[in-house]
């Protein structure tokens, strides 16, 4: 490429989290080059003997790819020319967590940036009125979480109240023996109030809200990844 080795280019990554069993993205951008054939992208993982992914001369070069990533990686080939070196990681595994390096060579020079990739399981909670219960009860369910999260109930009317004494949370291992179903029940619920079920681990924070009035029930859910700028 005629690179002197003295020039460095700017490479930018974003810390992110992957939901195990689903596809994930490891984000990386760089100063673009006018010729695709002059761009080399290498994705490395700390402590791994082979490459995560290599893209050079306009195509994937996977002869030295580590077996743990075989068949699971892809770059967005049509976006490389505009400086997108992001990696798509299929079927995220718990063991994919770690420090990754996005290493770029272009005709302008070379550069790299590390990113921290966390893996776990996180899902939206759904809060429902439990009509089977003897008293007014809410049931908050989320199908997949890992590591085991904390569950906290809150209420709009009784702000700052501690509901731990009037709630019960259980964790049920899912069939793949890693993720767990989260079920939390809140007792002694009053009408005309909005209750929030907040589920959180070190990867994600999710909230399920339910507003119960005499005439209607309104629900809303929200999920936020932690320690991630994405």
């Amino acid at each position: 490429f005629g690179i002197s080795g003295r020039h460095s280019i700017t490479v930018t990554t974003v810390a992110s989290a992957g939901n195990i069993g689903e596809d994930g993205i490891l984000s990386c951008t760089f100063e673009p080059d006018i010729k695709l054939s002059d761009i080399v992208i290498q994705w490395l993982k700390e402590g791994v003997l082979g490459l995560v992914h290599e893209f050079k001369e306009g195509k994937d070069e996977l002869s030295e790819q580590d077996e743990m990533f075989r068949g699971r990686t892809a770059v967005f080939a049509d976006q490389v020319i505009v400086g997108n070196a992001s990696l798509r990681l299929k079927n995220v595994q718990l063991t994919d967590a770690g420090t990754y390096k996005c290493y770029i060579i272009t005709s302008k020079g070379k550069g790299n940036a590390n990113l921290e990739y966390k893996t776990g399981a996180f899902s939206m909670p759904e809060v429902n009125v439990d009509y089977n219960a003897s008293s007014e009860t809410l049931r908050c369910e989320a199908p997949r979480w890992f590591p085991q999260p904390t569950v906290v109930w809150a209420s709009q009317v009784d702000q700052g109240a501690n509901f731990s004494e009037v709630s019960n949370t259980s964790f049920e291992l899912n069939s793949e023996n890693v993720t767990m179903k989260v079920v939390s029940v809140l007792y002694n619920v009053t009408i005309n109030n909005t209750y929030s079920c907040m589920i959180e681990n070190d990867i994600a924070k999710a909230t399920g809200d339910i507003k119960v009035t005499e005439s209607e029930i309104k629900r809303r859910s929200h999920l936020q990844l932690l320690n991630s700028k994405a």
Epitope: L44, E46, G47, V48, L49, G50, E64, E67, T95, G98
Partner: antibody, heavy 122, light 107 residues
Framework: EVQLLESGGGLVQPGGSLRLSCAAS????????MSWVRQAPGKGLEWVSA????????YYADSVKGRFTISRDNSKNTLYLQMNSLRAEDTAVYYC???????????????WGQGTLVTVSS | DIQMTQSPSSLSASVGDRVTITCRAS??????LAWYQQKPGKAPKLLIY???SLEGGVPSRFSGSGSGTDFTLTISSLQPEDFATYYC?????????FGQGTKVEIK
Amino acid sequence: EVQLLESGGGLVQPGGSLRLSCAASGFTFSSYAMSWVRQAPGKGLEWVSAISGGGGSTYYADSVKGRFTISRDNSKNTLYLQMNSLRAEDTAVYYCARDIQWYGESTLFDYWGQGTLVTVSS
Amino acid sequence: DIQMTQSPSSLSASVGDRVTITCRASQSTRSWLAWYQQKPGKAPKLLIYKASSLEGGVPSRFSGSGSGTDFTLTISSLQPEDFATYYCQQYGSYSRTFGQGTKVEIK
């Protein structure tokens, strides 16, 4: 100071099992792949097995595949080698060595333990 | 697996001599080659990595060259403490194959 200390070697009968341990200190253990290397008496070095920093990938020499299992406990900074169906030709000094941190960028086998002797004999 | 062949298997030399050991890989290993020195009863010591990079603390009389399949370790002026066995090792694949070793003895 980086230190690697192997233990668990000894005399075992053919067909028997043994578990070697390697206690690591002085570096961020989970950031490095680790390897086991052996040396039969009076012979050369033979790479046996390696494991990635997070433990998600394991690698074996053909001579031990299916009989040996490498593992690590990053919370204890310890590397293991479970050796089953041992044969006379497995007799050797077994060394643990620090492997790479980054593919293509870093040194490897820059630190070694003192070795532990495994003797397979009836 | 990539096979590594070292030559010679042993050599006799005098203090001050220039010594060259060669290592050939059965297939390309790019520049992923290391050289080690081992003395009797001791663990091996890393001398060279990435074919030509000198490990910290190793005397500059040791040098490495080559890429692909052919590699060389050179000791420019042999010292008394250099009498030992030297091993090459490839790490261009998941396995880490060693050469059979070259024993450097006093003439």
